[in-house]
Interface confidence: medium
């Protein structure tokens, strides 16, 4: 593992069953309690849950666990201390870190990534660090939808 | 530090609307990661959600008052405003702005300072 | 909508003693509650966030646990200063609701 520190769990929020729809961006609608940022809508939450318990509540929300484009793609939530879990996990198959579309993980994205235990899952900080945990620890997470 | 101040008149005559304006100081209105809330408190009694008002516009509002509830919100003065139509002597209470974070506590974490709205004639 | 049911009405206590307020929520709102102190002519202060978080500023002798439909708000040793009404808040779901408030009172 690298010297970043998780800090104490900060919880925020959960989707309530109202889906109107906000537009938050200069192109997109998300539902409600989501942040619209450039084109892509957010989920932030609160509740801590296992990798898989994470990748599930963001199906069920019809999206998906982060898969970053970019390392300042959540700068609106740079002031953040947190760790989340995002789509990121080891294919024994591909011998490689794929994200949950089945795309590679870039060598730019995480430079550290080759020390990274192929057993954990990926948490992600919003200024750009990330930590391998056991995919059965618990953490917030983040859902993204990418609405163009 | 995040302030916000209330204004508005303190008397509405039964079945005209009720107006109330708050202005954000120390911070931008639009920020991605707050909404923006209205909460009424009658005399004696417990706290009532009116609505929220993202930056967009986009609102979401009480079910009990949507029908007579509008939220809006002006980034170029970084103030958002509450109009209650065809208020009753029900809707005397003291009204707050405030805001909710998106991203930590998700609970009313700055208040305005209130405003005693009184409906009589 | 989610209702909040808060239990005792009225807490009479002295200075120095300990306080347990109960919120009882009618369907499960995970960890998503806050409490909130008020003081008369006041608007009411943040305490508690995601049910156990403390607000910034917030003395530590006021905790916060529970989770799903019953949760408490507890101050370890009150203060003059804590004798007020303490509300709960919900945004498990929308709307956003509260509860009728505990009103806390020196004996």
């Known amino acids: 593992k690298n010297s970043f520190t998780k800090l104490s769990i900060e919880p925020a929020f959960t989707p309530g069953p109202n889906i109107e729809l906000q537009k938050d961006s200069d192109c997109c609608s998300c539902q409600e309690k989501w942040v619209g940022y450039r084109c892509n809508c957010y989920f932030i939450s609160s509740e801590q849950k296992t990798w898989n318990e994470s990748r599930h509540l963001c199906a069920s929300q019809k999206s998906s666990l982060l898969q970053l484009q970019n390392t300042d793609e959540l700068d609106f939530m740079s002031s953040s201390q947190q760790f989340y879990w995002i789509g990121l996990s080891y294919s024994e198959e591909h011998t490689a870190w794929l994200w949950e579309n089945g795309s590679a993980l870039s060598q730019y994205l995480f430079p550290s990534f080759e020390t990274f235990n192929t057993k954990n899952c990926i948490a992600y900080n919003p200024n750009g660090n990330a930590l391998d945990e056991s995919c059965e620890d618990k953490n917030r997470y983040i859902c993204k939808q990418q609405l163009i | 530090q995040v302030q916000l101040q209330q204004s508005g008149p303190g008397l509405v005559k039964p079945s005209e609307t009720l107006s109330l304006t708050c202005t954000v100081s120390?911070?931008?209105?639009?920020?991605?990661?707050?909404?923006w809330g209205w909460i009424r408190q009658p005399p004696g009694k417990g706290l009532e959600w009116i609505g929220s008002i993202y930056y967009s516009g986009s609102t979401y509002y009480n079910p009990s008052l949507k029908s007579r509830v509008t939220i809006s919100v002006d980034t170029s003065k970084n103030q958002f405003s509450l109009n209650l139509s065809s208020v009753t002597a029900a809707d005397t209470a003291v009204y707050y702005c405030a805001r909710l974070p998106l991203t930590g506590e998700f609970a009313f974490d700055i208040w305005g300072q209130g405003t005693m709205v009184t409906v009589s004639s | 909508e989610i209702v909040l049911t808060q239990s005792p009405a009225t807490l009479s206590l002295s200075p120095g003693e300990r306080a347990t307020l109960s919120c009882r929520a009618s369907?499960?709102?995970?960890?998503?509650l806050a409490w909130f102190q008020q003081k008369p002519g006041q608007a009411p202060r943040l305490l508690i966030y995601?049910?156990?978080s403390r607000a910034t500023g917030i003395p530590d002798r006021f905790s916060g646990s529970g989770s799903g439909t019953d949760f408490t708000l507890t101050i370890s040793r009150l203060e003059p200063e804590d004798f007020a009404v303490y509300y709960c808040q919900q945004y498990g779901s929308s709307p956003i609701t509260f509860g009728q408030g505990t009103r806390l009172e020196i004996k």
């Open positions: 120390g911070g931008s209105i639009s920020s991605i990661i707050y909404y």
């Open positions: 369907q499960s709102v995970s960890t998503y």
């Open positions: 995601g049910a156990s």
